[in-house]
């Protein structure tokens, strides 16, 4: 209370003291900061706390995204784009909210995280909680059997997220898929691929991808004795095998999940294996897998994907896991998933995985779950785990503090004397209607050193100052910020000069 | 808690330059007016100079105005104080400062300051 | 500039004495005014902001009074731990000036 009493009576000297100051018709840029001092006081004092108790903040699982990060990101996001357009996709969109029926249904124990919206005048709504399912909906609602497109949107998911960790409820997802009858695993070598180049491309660290096949896992059940009905919950034990170890999975599958201590025991012998090839190989000499027929498909095409890996180049980044086996209900073939990797502490150890940054699978039924007649059209496709990259990305720039420039203005336009407003307007539209970025300050008469300080804050390369004697000459003082070496330069030239400069192509194509 | 950490000074000729640093911890750097102030060993304190929020204001004490710049990094949490032209008057323990209620100019926290020496 | 004048510039008093500081500004400051203690190789630290308002964790025994030109920290019984320099600053125009201090002795 006493805090809040200061508060007020602070407003209220500083209330006086702008007064006083307009009366005595003090200097405007004193006014000026006096009274934002005022204002900032006033907000400090927020509502009166009798009357509001609220905290602004953003909701639980969500954040802001200051100029800092929106450069991260857009850097993110080109390599991703970059990567998706060279490999051919094209772009979509769809709502951020589906039908509630529509999402019903295809993501097993992980519909609890679905958010529903309330009642909008009688439709049921969800917010999207991936971008597959929308994809899905839309090509069985277009009739489409073909095509290769990539999403980039935010989805949301109920979850206690550990923020810290680049996990929220709203997150971006960077999804590729490709949809169509092809010859088999020609399109998911290709997404492997995509997913390779595009964690390659971002820098961040060792990465391994892990891959898996549905049927290799449901027969692999099947033949350890694991009933129909339990193979989803029992899936999504084993996917916990890269967080937990064995026992503790044992211990859920058995005690929580009702499993046989002996088919838990048969299990484990198939599901702490990982390897390559080798391990295909070795899988499609095993007796009693290699006698059930999804397994066998399974394993036929891992081993046509490692042949395509190893043309693509990327063998060597893909490890062959059999705990592998990714929460999503609606995957029926091969499924993938990219960790980064930490240093081991001594040589010799395995590498360890800090967290998924990328995933995917083929989900071939998913489409005809939306047809009348069940028409499926087969699919496969990745997802980037943008969010992660971000955190990854961010932290490295801060370790290595390292300056990121948050606009891309090329040049300022500035002048070195007084009453030259007019003429700098002329010339920033001018360098505008050239497409070049420009800025200028917004103050009729600024000090030129002021102007200059802007630059290095805001890591503008280039000064365009405009002086009376220039202007007489038909010249421009085109000075390099960093350099701050100055040379006149025509007027006539100065956009070709500038272009030239910050190697901008000197035609808008 | 609030921490503001000087760094930077030392022993310079008349006519040198230095650069002060101020680390902050603690509390929101980007919404405080910060300062500097100094005081000569065995004199009083005189406030130097402080610069807003936001970096749009800046004043300067008669006695350093065109030698020091004060400047701030809202992203690294930290204050400077760039000295050229050094005198030696200009000897004191200099301390990083932090305003009252963001804006007031008291100086509510206070480093443990930074000596800085100009003598031949 | 506002020039700030202390008294006395120095005063010897025993522990548990009610001691009075006075400033006075060269011209009106209203209440933005603020006193200071500094002890020896120490920062100095905030006793009172804006003539009366005490400063959190400050013990009640200091308070500050005035408005305009002159203003008065009292210290109403000493403690062993206030014997320090003290010094009030004005807060309404830049440059901002202290007054030359009042160092507070054992006697």
């Known amino acids: 209370m006493a805090e809040r009493a200061a508060l007020e009576e602070l407003v209220k000297l500083q209330g006086e003291r702008v007064r006083g100051l307009k009366q005595q018709k003090a200097s405007a840029e004193l006014i000026e900061e006096e009274v934002a001092k005022l204002l900032k006081l006033k907000a400090q004092l927020g509502p009166d706390e009798s009357k509001q108790k609220f905290v602004l903040k953003t909701p639980k699982g969500t954040r802001d995204y200051s100029p800092r990060q929106m450069a991260v990101r857009e850097k993110v996001f080109d390599v991703i784009i970059r990567c998706f357009k060279r490999h051919g996709a094209e772009v979509i969109d769809t709502p951020v909210f589906e039908l509630k029926e529509t999402l019903m249904g295809k993501y097993g124990e992980d519909s609890k995280l679905i958010y529903d919206l309330k009642d909008q005048g009688g439709e049921l709504l969800s917010l999207r909680y991936d971008l597959t399912v929308p994809f899905a909906r839309y090509l069985a609602m277009n009739k489409l059997t073909n095509i290769k497109r990539y999403h980039i949107a935010k989805v949301y998911r109920r979850d206690n997220p550990a923020m810290t960790r680049g996990r929220y409820r709203e997150f971006y997802q960077c999804d590729f898929d490709i949809a169509g009858n092809f010859d088999p695993m020609i399109p998911d070598a290709e997404c492997l691929k995509i997913m390779c180049e595009i964690l390659s491309s971002l820098q961040i660290g060792d990465f391994l991808v892990k891959v898996n096949d549905r049927r290799i896992l449901d027969g692999m059940f099947a033949i350890c004795g694991v009933s129909d009905s339990k193979f989803r919950t029992i899936c999504s034990s084993v996917d916990k095998l890269d967080k937990v170890s064995w026992e503790e999975v044992k211990n859920e599958m058995v005690g929580e999940k009702g499993l046989a201590p002996e088919v838990a025991d048969r299990i484990g012998d198939y599901v702490q294996q990982h390897g390559g090839v080798s391990l295909v190989e070795q899988l499609l000499q095993d007796p009693k897998l290699s006698q059930n027929k999804q397994a066998l498909e399974g394993l036929g095409d891992l081993k046509l994907l490692f042949e395509y890996l190893t043309l693509f180049g990327i063998d060597d980044k893909i490890s062959f896991d059999l705990s592998l086996a990714r929460g999503l209900d609606y995957y029926t073939g091969v499924i993938y998933e990219a960790v980064l990797l930490q240093t081991p502490a001594q040589a010799g150890e395995e590498p360890l995985g800090v967290g998924s940054v990328a995933a995917g699978g083929r989900y071939d039924g998913l489409v005809g779950m939306f047809d009348p007649k069940g028409r499926k059209v087969p699919c496969v496709g990745l997802s980037i785990g943008v969010e992660r990259i971000f955190s990854i990305v961010e932290q490295r720039l801060e370790a290595l503090e390292e300056k990121i420039r948050t606009t891309e203005t090329q040049v300022l336009v500035a002048s070195a004397q007084k009453k030259l407003l007019e003429e700098r307007l002329k010339l920033v539209s001018e360098l505008w209607d050239a497409g070049i970025k420009a800025e200028l300050l917004y103050k009729k008469n600024p000090k030129l050193l002021n102007q200059l300080q802007y630059c290095e804050e805001a890591g503008i390369p280039l000064v365009a100052i405009i002086g009376e004697q220039e202007l007489k000459d038909g010249v421009i003082k085109l000075r390099s910020v960093t350099s701050r070496e100055e040379v006149d330069v025509r007027r006539e030239d100065l956009v070709e000069e500038i272009k030239r400069r910050t190697g901008q192509p000197l035609c808008i194509c | 808690q609030v921490q503001l950490v000087e760094s930077g000074g030392g022993l310079v000729k008349p006519g040198g330059s230095l650069r002060l640093s101020c680390a902050a911890s603690g509390f929101t750097f980007s919404d405080y007016y910060m300062s500097w102030i100094r005081q000569a060993p065995g004199k009083g304190l005189e406030w130097v100079s402080y610069?807003?929020?936001?970096?749009?204001?800046?004043k300067y004490t008669d006695s350093v105005r065109g030698r020091f710049t004060i400047s701030r990094d809202n992203a690294k949490n930290s204050l400077y104080l760039q000295m050229n032209s050094l005198r030696a008057e200009d000897t004191a323990v200099y301390y990083c400062?932090?305003?009252?209620?963001?804006?007031?100019?008291?100086?509510?926290?206070w480093g443990q300051g930074t000596l800085v020496t100009v003598s031949s | 500039d506002i020039q700030m004048t202390q008294s006395p510039s120095s005063v010897s008093a025993s522990v548990g004495d009610r001691v009075t500081i006075t400033c006075r500004a060269s011209q009106g400051i209203s209440s933005w005014l603020a006193w200071f203690q500094q002890k020896p190789g120490k920062a100095p630290k905030l006793l009172i902001y804006v003539a009366s308002n005490l400063e959190s964790g400050v013990p009640s025994r200091f308070s500050g009074s005035g408005s305009g030109t002159d203003f008065t920290l009292t210290i109403s019984s000493l403690q062993p731990e206030d014997f320090a320099t003290y010094y009030c600053?004005?807060?309404?125009?830049?440059?901002?000036?202290f007054g030359q201090g009042t160092k507070l002795e054992i006697k």
């Open positions: 400062a932090r305003y009252l209620y963001q804006v007031i100019a008291i100086a509510k926290s």
């Open positions: 600053q004005q807060a309404n125009s830049f440059p901002y000036t």
């Open positions: 610069i807003s929020d936001s970096s749009r204001y800046t």
